[in-house]
Interface confidence: low
């Protein structure tokens, strides 16, 4: 377990190589979760990009967080997608948060502390627990299958995941630095495996 | 700018087909889903039918009132898009509207609507 | 399905009045609703989405809110290019049900 306080991966170079992959300790599938994480790329109006991809053995698209260029973000559960369109792409370290839960099917997507309107994917799914998570890189089979067209190029850090879904008030608190404890993958007790070129830097954004 | 072109409406039997068309132009057909909305002369406006994009395996989506009978589909090579309308009722009858999704792919607001093409069931 | 119940089925109002239309949701739709008018001949326009927000070239004279499962649209000030029809339409979920529509006659 590595403390990454105030460190981020950089992916330095488009490639269908790079990448990092986390252990996370799930025992039991997942009704709900939250994802939390930054990110700071060139790439918005460029190309899409991975920017968080967990994968079973029975779909590769188990959760994706995906940026679609001239669209916005791409949010998949179980292989089915939703799309939360941003107009305008600008250059700067991004915070985003996303969850979902099971029950309703529900959906929260926030950017930089900003919640977008509440959307339905899946409900009823559930989330499988023996997963390859990876950052970089979009899985299109488990654990592997890249393409370098996908590829994130700039950094990430902060990736946070809970089991549950978070409230606005601990998505705020989280967006604004304070204390928290996820119980899935947690970035000051990580567990992970670098792969070909990526490097650990300082973090840019506050 | 988003151009949606319907073709192939008409008169129709009772218990007849059709099938009507649209074409899309001025936006990346293939990455949005795409639905018909139909509206029957002085009444409202009924969603009918969805398919989305090739990455959501195309599923489609019916209403209750044309499930088994009308099936919708896409060309993506063509920027086509396609419903067929089966066993018609006078019911059926509606300018129908070919409309695409906004920028989300299950559940959405339709900020693009083609002129539509009229449908006319009658013996 | 989410039933969409719009009021008034009808209004007859004058150039330069507000005018506010309703639309309640049979459940909880989490602001997944847009606001379209129709003029006469001519297809549905899309004005709101996602309950409060303007879609590209709309005026600020109309806005959206929302209060639980009601929603409204507001048109201050109205132009004689605003009469038509408006029909709000919810997008949670499947089948996107629309209203029964408000027809928005000249006084």
């Known amino acids: 377990q590595t403390d990454m306080s105030r460190k981020a991966f950089v992916f330095p170079k488009e490639s269908d190589t790079s990448y990092v992959s986390l252990k996370a300790p799930l025992t039991k599938p997942l009704k709900a979760f939250t994802v939390c994480l930054h990110f700071y790329t060139e790439l918005s109006s460029t190309r899409g990009y991975s920017i968080f991809s967990y994968a079973t053995k029975r779909q590769d698209n188990e959760i994706l967080i995906f940026w679609s260029k001239d669209i916005g973000y791409s949010f998949t559960v179980g292989g089915s997608e939703i799309l939360f369109e941003v107009p305008e792409v600008t250059v700067a370290p991004v915070h985003i948060c996303t969850s979902w839960e099971s029950a309703s099917g529900i959906v929260e997507f926030w950017v930089d502390g900003k919640p977008r309107v509440r959307k339905s994917l899946k409900k009823g799914y559930t989330v499988g627990a023996e997963a390859s998570i990876i950052l970089g890189q979009e899985q299109d089979s488990f654990g592997g299958n890249f393409e370098g067209s996908q590829s994130l190029v700039g950094d990430i850090g902060n990736v946070n995941m809970w089991d549950f879904v978070l409230s606005p008030d601990e998505i705020n608190t989280i967006y604004l630095g304070g204390p928290f404890s996820p119980n899935v993958l947690n970035w000051r007790a990580l567990k992970y495996e670098v792969q070909g070129e990526v490097f650990t830097k300082p973090q840019l954004w506050p | 700018e988003v151009q949606l072109e319907e073709s192939g409406g008409g008169l129709v039997q009772p218990k007849g087909s059709l099938k009507l068309s649209c074409a899309a132009s001025g936006f990346s057909f293939n990455t949005y889903a795409m639905n018909w909305v139909r509206q029957a002369p002085g009444k409202g406006l009924e969603w009918v039918a969805l398919?989305?994009?090739?990455?959501?395996?195309?599923?489609?989506n019916y209403a209750d009132s044309v499930k088994d009978r009308f099936s919708i589909s896409r060309d993506d090579s063509e920027n086509m898009l396609y419903l067929q309308m089966n066993n018609l009722k006078s019911e059926d009858s509606a300018m129908y509207y070919c409309?695409?999704?906004?920028?989300?792919?299950?559940?959405?607001?339709?900020?693009?609507w083609g002129q539509g093409t009229l449908v006319t069931v009658s013996a | 399905d989410i039933v969409m119940t719009q009021s008034p089925a009808s209004l007859s109002v004058s150039v330069g009045e507000t005018v506010t239309i309703t639309c309640r949701a049979s459940?909880?739709?989490?602001?997944?609703l847009a606001w379209y008018q129709q003029k006469q001949g001519n297809s549905p326009q899309l004005l709101v989405y996602?309950?409060?927000n303007l879609a590209d070239g709309v005026p600020s004279r109309f806005s959206g809110s929302v209060s639980g499962t009601q929603y409204s649209l507001k048109i201050n000030s109205l132009q004689s290019e605003d009469f038509g029809i408006y029909y709000c339409q919810h997008f949670w979920g499947s089948p996107p049900t629309f209203g029964g529509g408000t027809k928005l006659e000249i006084k």
């Open positions: 996602a309950a409060t």
């Open positions: 459940e909880n739709i989490y602001s997944n």
């Open positions: 409309v695409r999704h906004g920028a989300v792919v299950e559940g959405a607001w339709f900020p693009y």
């Open positions: 398919i989305r994009s090739k990455s959501n395996n195309y599923e489609t």
